[in-house]
Amino acid sequence: PEPPTACREKQYLINSQCCSLCQPGQKLVSDCTEFTETECLPCGESEFLDTWNRETHCHQHKYCDPNLGLRVQQKGTSETDTICTCEEGWHCTSEACESCVLHRSCSPGFGVKQIATGVSDTICEPCPVGFFSNVSSAFEKCHPWTSCETKDLVVQQAGTNKTDVVCGPQDRLRA
């Protein structure tokens, strides 16, 4: 018979033959042959593989480094990685939670809608028209543009979400 060019799900093609993939939690020791099945071995104590695979090495579980404020939220198994979270009152810097911050700052152009608490991080909001923020801050709201009119001045440069308006003297030239 013709050698296969594609294999079924949970199989892989090697040496013109379809071999079974190793199940999650196990790594490949040797490919199948015409006479033998794929040989797989369970991952070690601090290792995992989370897919049907033909990997010859398992992945190391993530280390939740206490020096970065991390602790274990969910212990890894042979099929799942360890999930880290931050110590109480601290917040993950990313979805992968590789480090912790006390709270995040809102970038220029954004103001603080809600200051961080022990359970929720800083909530930022974009500065609407008429308001600006030119700093990175974990407490400052968007500031209103300066009103040139109330100072008997005129707008020389329009404001943006990151900059205040620039006021200047009125043109007093007469025709």
Partner: nanobody
């Protein structure tokens, strides 16, 4: 990288005053937003006060408004917290923090105990 060292804590009677200092070494605090945060025994972190990089804007938690004053002296690379009319509920370890507020910038804190 910046190291922050808090000092000035101690035992004080209710109604008394203390001035906490936070001295930075290894890097400047100039231009950086700074915070005071506290942790009472068996409680979570509470954000007490903050000051903008320019020193022009400040924030105070409702629980300390009118009693605490935050200030900075960039020439001395030091942040301060003047605490007046102290109450038993102000008892906590006080920490300072500098933007970007990462865990490895965290100081050891200074213990404030308010008791008669």
């Amino acid at each position: 990288e910046v190291q922050l060292l808090e000092s000035g804590g101690g035992l004080v009677q209710p109604g008394g005053s203390l001035r906490l200092s936070c001295a930075a070494s290894g890097s400047t605090i100039a231009g950086y937003e700074m915070w005071w945060v506290r942790q009472a025994p068996g409680k979570g972190l509470e954000r007490v006060s903050a000051i903008s990089g320019s020193g022009g804007s400040t924030y105070y938690a409702d629980s300390v408004k009118g009693r605490f004053t935050i200030s900075r002296d960039d020439s001395k690379n030091t942040l301060y917290l003047q605490m007046n009319s102290l109450r038993a509920e102000d008892t906590a370890v006080y920490y300072c923090a500098r933007d970007p507020y990462s865990f490895d910038y965290w100081g050891q804190g200074t213990l404030v105990t308010v008791s008669s």
